[in-house]
Amino acid sequence: LVPHLGDREKRDSVCPQGKYIHPQNNSICCTKCHKGTYLYNDCPGPGQDTDCRECESGSFTASENHLRHCLSCSKCRKEMGQVEISSCTVDRDTVCGCRKNQYRHYWSENLFQCFNCSLCLNGTVHLSCQEKQNTVCTCHAGFFLRENECVSCSNCKKSLECTKLCLPQIENVKGTEDSGTT
């Protein structure tokens, strides 16, 4: 089965790598523009130069192309806790990330929010915090895991999801209550 190609891909596949087919004359293959530049004018004829211009400030192209405009630089989302790791250049988009001891939680394919890595207080680190994964904690006896934080079993009430993890403590509380009645 031949994969379906869009018009642009079909046109490009006629020319050798690094070239594209002239939009007005399909017998001419023009050289693509280098990264950091964009197509200002198609080459006038075979073997003649494509007119490429450097991207202006605030825009970029990260690969060879025949785009009529450079792409706008991304802005890091401060409201998501993002910080700029590296600034936008003519040939590379802004790189955004999180601060030290934070991880990325992706709400969608391209949008992430920064959250603090769990410290595993009242527990031990089972797996260290990573770029896209919070620390995995194992809690000490008398504590249960809630949103990846170790919480005292004294905060556990019957019928909550912690009861199995805090079973001895729950039973002790029950025993104390029972012993108080005659």
């Epitope: 991880y103 769990s118 949103e147």
Partner: nanobody, 120 residues
Framework: EVQLLESGGGLVQPGGSLRLSCAAS????????MGWVRQAPGKGLGWVSA????????YYADSVRGRFTISRDNSKNTLYLQMNSLRAEDTAVYYC?????????????RGQGTLVTVSS
Amino acid sequence: EVQLLESGGGLVQPGGSLRLSCAASGFTFGWYWMGWVRQAPGKGLGWVSAISGSGGSTYYADSVRGRFTISRDNSKNTLYLQMNSLRAEDTAVYYCAKVKLGGGPNFDYRGQGTLVTVSS
């Protein structure tokens, strides 16, 4: 057993408003981030909005920011989504979901959904 029951969906004209509610049970509601995901006809699931357990931190998708407001009442174990200035592209099944932070899938439970149709 975790249960999430949505209500409040329906047919509304463009520019109109709706308020979705989600009644939660089977877990300690106030401990967890909760949110709304939606699935438009023929499209995948996507996060609309989410709110932390205390209500102090929120997330909104760019497409709904300024039009939708998420809130919660921990004493009633209920999550809300106030939707204003509705558009045809907001037509979708809206699901209440318990957010799973920390990596991997974005939610560990979701409800059966409520249909929102924006049409004149």
